[in-house]
Every structure is written in structure tokens, then in C-alpha cells.
Interface confidence: low
């Protein structure tokens, strides 16, 4: 008996050939002897099978002695032995239909689990192997699970189902919903405008949901909601915003926030969450703001930074074109009785300058100038 594997939703063509190369009487039946289709002269006739309008043939091939059974939009329950009766002979074809589906949705949040479920006909014992877009292979039986989805898992998953030494391949497109970056840090001098951007790592035709930016200022004892917004078909509308700071938000994607000016009291960490319609869970992106201030008070020149800096960052004060007068792995440095000239405050990481603020120290009888 010939075995043919089919995919749920696809079309399969079961062949039946007569020795005479001409159109003769034929019909296809299932294992219950219920007629599916046949011919009446040059007309196709249908029996009372549940295949209904999904069964067809190719009349153009009948004159060549070929009488295929075409089944469209295959269902698992179409798995059966199909019998072609032609010229007093019977040709039997066993059709096994498999389906492979993602647990709930093919759009999943980063960190969620992907479960692929194989639908198979009773009595079959298939094996499945799937290859992720990043080349990871997983094997299983009826279900295959991948926990903690990563951004790199977005793309086409190719799964091969093996049964009776025959195989059928499924391709499932998975979209991992996430921000492009899990975390970002912005370095600004006091008074500068701050731009926060939250680009998404996926594109969908319609994107609807709501979001919020919670902010934990370094100086504050608790976090505060700075802004809440809605997203409708990729259009952003602000619902509520604090008066201090008064953030501004772009109306289009990518999500874009503007802080009018960097101030020490705003330095800290924020968490932007985005809840998408019809999705459980939220997308998260952390954003950090580091603010630098250089001041001269009487005989003391001070440079300070606020916000989440790593212990390996170096803060330095130096006179322009000279060696650093002071360098420390701390958040404040100062120089007493600084010489007149242009002083630079530098925040650096392994020699790379992250943030720089200049302050002009005038001779002692003048007041300092901050460019």
C-alpha cells in the first residue's frame, strides 16, 4: 500500500492510473466504502463523503488514463485509506495528514515559551525535529517546547515530521516581541535636553497597546510614573504625564521621549513597559540617565555625577591640555584653589570619554564662567 504524507491546510493529490490511456469510468472511495468522487462521462460526480467541496480531480488528465483525487484544505481527520476503483482493479493509498501549530500565537513576548504541537492521525507514531532560526535543533514527539525565547529566535522555524520513512516539512514563522535593546544609558551635562528612544525589534501591520515609564530617581526614596500612553495602529497618544519633569512623546513609532533638560534630581533608572493588545505579559526596556555638573564655589572647583554609574568609571578634573589634577572612581571630585583657565570634567570608561563638561576658572578677583 502506497503511503502519502500531507500537511493540514495544504492540498494533496493522490494518483490513480489506468492501463488504457483514455477516459473511462472510475471512482474514489474511502475505507468505509463511501464514494468521494468519480465520473459520469466527462462530468465529475461527488458522493456523500465529508470531503464535500474539498475533493476534486483533474479532468484534463482523464484522457491520458490518470484519475487523481485532489483534496484541498487537508484536515487531520482526512487521514484514511483511499481506494481508486478503475478497470476492475483497486489502487489503495494511505494518506496521513499532520499539522504543526504554535501553542497560542506565533507572536510571543521575549522570555515566553514556545510550544509546538503536532497533530497526527490515530495509530501514527511520527518523530519531529525542529531547527530554530539561530540553528538550534530540538527533537520531540507530540509536543516540542522552547523556554525563554530570545530575540534571535525570531524568524522561520523549520520542522520535519518523519513517518514510515517518509517526511513532511513545516515552516512556522515566529515573531519574538521585544525592544531592540534590553537596556540603554544616556549621559548628559546638566541643562541639556535628553532624548530617550525605545525601538522595537519587530514590525507588525497593526500595533495596539498601552505603556508607561516608571522612574526611580537616585535621590528619591520611591519610583514614580513619569508618563502613560496608548498605542493604536502605531499612533502614540499620551494619557497622563507628570508636571515635573514634563516629558514630551513622539506621535509615531519608534517610541521616543524627550526630557526638556537634564537635572541631578532626574538622574536615575527608568523602566518602560509596553502591554500589547491580546498578549499576556509586557515588553520591558530599562533606561538610565547619568547627569554631570561642574561648579566653582569660592576656592573649590567641583565635578559631580548622578545616576547609575559602574564602579569602574573614572571621574577626572584637568586643566585643558594638561595632566589630570584629580582622578577617582567616585561620583564627585574637586580641586581647591584651581588655577585660572579652562577646566574639563571627564567621565570615562577604560580611556573612552563618556561625558565631558567644561568650566572656565577666572583669576581670583572674577566670578567663574560656564560655557
Amino acid at each position: 500500500k502506497k503511503v502519502v504524507l500531507g500537511k493540514k491546510g495544504d492540498t494533496v493529490e493522490l494518483t490513480c492510473t489506468a492501463s488504457q490511456k483514455k477516459s473511462i469510468q472510475f471512482h474514489w472511495k474511502n475505507s468505509n466504502q463511501i464514494k468521494i468522487l468519480g465520473n459520469q462521462g466527462s462530468f465529475l460526480t461527488k458522493g456523500p463523503s465529508k470531503l464535500n467541496d474539498r475533493a476534486d480531480s483533474r479532468r484534463s488528465l482523464w484522457d491520458q488514463g490518470n484519475f487523481p483525487l485532489i483534496i484541498k484544505n487537508l484536515k487531520i481527520e482526512d487521514s484514511d485509506t483511499y481506494i481508486c476503483e478503475v478497470e476492475d482493479q483497486k489502487e489503495e493509498v494511505q494518506l496521513l495528514v499532520f499539522g504543526l501549530t504554535a501553542n497560542s500565537d506565533t507572536h510571543l513576548l521575549q522570555g515566553q515559551s514556545l510550544t509546538l504541537t503536532l497533530e497526527s492521525p490515530p495509530g501514527s507514531s511520527p518523530s519531529v525535529q525542529c531547527r530554530s532560526p539561530r540553528g538550534k535543533n530540538i527533537q520531540g514527539g507530540k509536543t516540542l517546547s522552547v523556554s525563554q525565547l530570545e530575540l534571535q529566535d525570531s524568524g522561520t522555524w523549520t520542522c520535519t515530521v518523519l513517518q514510515n520513512q517518509k517526511k513532511v516539512e513545516f515552516k512556522i514563522d515566529i515573531v519574538v516581541l521585544a525592544f531592540q535593546k534590553a537596556s540603554s544609558i544616556v549621559y548628559k551635562k546638566e541643562g541639556e535636553q535628553v532624548e530617550f528612544s525605545f525601538p522595537l525589534a519587530f514590525t507588525v501591520e497593526k500595533l495596539t497597546g498601552s505603556g508607561e515609564l516608571w522612574w526611580q530617581a537616585e535621590r528619591a526614596s520611591s519610583s514614580k510614573s513619569w508618563i502613560t500612553f496608548d498605542l493604536k495602529n502605531k499612533e502614540v497618544s499620551v494619557k497622563r504625564v507628570t508636571q515635573d519633569p514634563k516629558l514630551q512623546m513622539g506621535k509615531k513609532l519608534p517610541l521616543h521621549l524627550t526630557l526638556p533638560q537634564a537635572l541631578p534630581q532626574y538622574a536615575g533608572s527608568g523602566n518602560l513597559t509596553l502591554a500589547l493588545e491580546a498578549k499576556t505579559g509586557k515588553l520591558h526596556q530599562e533606561v538610565n540617565l547619568v547627569v554631570m555638573r561642574a561648579t566653582q564655589l569660592q576656592k573649590n572647583l567641583t565635578c559631580e555625577v548622578w545616576g547609575p554609574t559602574s564602579p569602574k568609571l573614572m571621574l577626572s578634573l584637568k586643566l585643558e591640555n594638561k595632566e589630570a589634577k584629580v582622578s577617582k572612581r567616585e561620583k564627585a571630585v574637586w580641586v581647591l584653589n584651581p588655577e585660572a583657565g579652562m577646566w574639563q570634567c571627564l567621565l570615562s570608561d577604560s580611556g573612552q570619554v563618556l561625558l565631558e563638561s567644561n568650566i572656565k576658572v577666572l583669576p581670583t578677583w572674577s566670578t567663574p564662567v560656564q560655557p
Epitope: 468522487l37 462530468f43 465529475l44 460526480t45 461527488k46 456523500p48 465529508k50 464535500n52 467541496d53 476534486d56 479532468r59
Partner: antibody, heavy 118, light 111 residues
Framework: QVQLVQSGAEVKKPGASVKVSCKAS????????ISWVRQAPGQGLEWMGE????????YYNEKFKGRVTNTRDTSTSTVYMELSSLRSEDTAVYYC???????????WGQGTLVTVSS | DIVMTQSPDSLAVSLGERATINCKAS??????????MNWYQQKPGQPPKLLIY???NLESGVPQRFSGSGSGTDFTLTISSLQAEDVAVYYC?????????FGGGTKVEIK
């Protein structure tokens, strides 16, 4: 717009045959299944069978098998339903109806009253 | 064949009041997450008109006061606020298995 226009009322004697036509317009004729549904006076709706205008293949309700024949003429976008060996209980309004997805009937003809009386 | 049983046979409701019609199938009409149940309205001398398809989807152009619910074997058509033009006979119909079968109808009148 989609229209299904049926032939006029018929009076037949028991044992005779009747052939009702349904002319389709406003869409691709071969793309949708046409069903026949009948309704006896003061009664409910009963599906008789359907025809696939593309292939001409038909499927009938077991109750009417052997008595009903559906045909089509693609040149005039017309479907025909012939019911033979008429009896008095076949007196009904016969409707043609076009399916949407699956067997739900979105568009209907105006109906043809067939009266079987001796 | 799947037998469809509608209740009540007739229903008298005041204008602006809610009307509820029930339909029970002799076996489940669910398949692959959908319920293959449709509802029609028929006025005297007219062909039936499709109102609701796949249990709860409103056909284009049908007023929002009509809604459908249910799954498996038990289904309901609700008219939230009956209008004079809603006086008609309402039929349920399953479209899962051939032959498609209809309920016996429910006549809705104004009290």
C-alpha cells in the same frame, strides 16, 4: 451587487417533474457554491443539495437522492434544479442561495412557488 | 443528520425589551475552535436573511442589537432592544456537517 433571480411559479400534477432556474449576476459565477433550500407552506427550511458551478459536480441531501438533479449553464450563469416524481408534499417555495465560507447562505433568490395538485 | 431544536416556538416581547431565542444541536457543531452556527431572519413573503454566522459574528449591515453566543450544542440569539421591524421568524442553522440543517423557527411578535 450580487443578485440571484429565479424563474416564476409553477403548478404541476403528481408524478410530473419541475425545473426551476436561478440566474446569478454581480460576481464570478464559478467561484461560489449554489444551494437549493425549500420551504413548505408554514414550515421550516430544508436543504436539498448544492452544485459547484465550476465543475458541475453536485451533492444532494439523502432525502432527495434520485429525485433531484442540479445542473448549470456557465454561458448564462444559470443554475437549474429539477425535481421529479412530484407529490403533493413537494408543494413549497424553492430558493436558490449562494454560500459564503462553508454552508452559510449569504445571498438568496426571491423564491419560486411550486404547487403540486391533481 | 444533525437535528436542530429551537425554543420557544413563539415569543411576544414589548418594544424596547430583550428577546432571547435558544437553539440546541443534537451533537456539537464545534470544529477547530469555531462553532458552525448561523442565524437567519425571515419576514413574510421574503427569503431568509443572514444575521449571525459562526455563532457570534454579525453579518455586514445587520444592526448591533442582534448578537449571538454559545458553543458546542447550545446557542442563543439575542435582540437587545426589540424594534417593530424585528417582527419575523428566526431560524438557526448548523453548517458543520452535510446536510446543513435548520431549526424549526421561532416567531417573534410584539406584546
Amino acid at each position: 451587487q450580487v443578485q440571484l433571480v429565479q424563474s416564476g411559479a409553477e403548478v404541476k400534477k403528481p408524478g410530473a417533474s419541475v425545473k426551476v432556474s436561478c440566474k446569478a449576476s454581480g460576481y464570478t459565477f464559478t467561484a461560489y457554491v449554489i444551494s437549493w433550500v425549500r420551504q413548505a407552506p408554514g414550515q421550516g427550511l430544508e436543504w436539498m443539495g448544492e452544485i459547484y458551478p465550476g465543475s458541475g459536480s453536485s451533492y444532494y441531501n439523502e432525502k432527495f437522492k434520485g429525485r433531484v438533479t442540479n445542473t448549470r449553464d456557465t454561458s448564462t450563469s444559470t443554475v437549474y434544479m429539477e425535481l421529479s416524481s412530484l407529490r403533493s408534499e413537494d408543494t413549497a417555495v424553492y430558493y436558490c442561495a449562494r454560500s459564503g465560507d462553508g454552508s452559510r447562505f449569504v445571498y438568496w433568490g426571491q423564491g419560486t412557488l411550486v404547487t403540486v395538485s391533481s | 443528520d444533525i437535528v436542530m431544536t429551537q425554543s420557544p416556538d413563539s415569543l411576544a416581547v414589548s418594544l424596547g425589551e430583550r428577546a432571547t431565542i435558544n437553539c440546541k444541536a443534537s451533537q456539537s457543531v464545534d470544529y477547530d475552535g469555531d462553532s458552525y452556527m448561523n442565524w437567519y431572519q425571515q419576514k413574510p413573503g421574503q427569503p431568509p436573511k443572514l444575521l449571525i454566522y459562526v455563532a457570534s459574528n454579525l453579518e455586514s449591515g445587520v444592526p448591533q442589537r442582534f448578537s449571538g453566543s454559545g458553543s458546542g450544542t447550545d446557542f442563543t440569539l439575542t435582540i437587545s432592544s426589540l424594534q417593530a421591524e424585528d417582527v419575523a421568524v428566526y431560524y438557526c442553522q448548523q453548517s458543520l456537517q452535510d446536510p446543513p440543517t435548520f431549526g424549526g423557527g421561532t416567531k417573534v411578535e410584539i406584546k
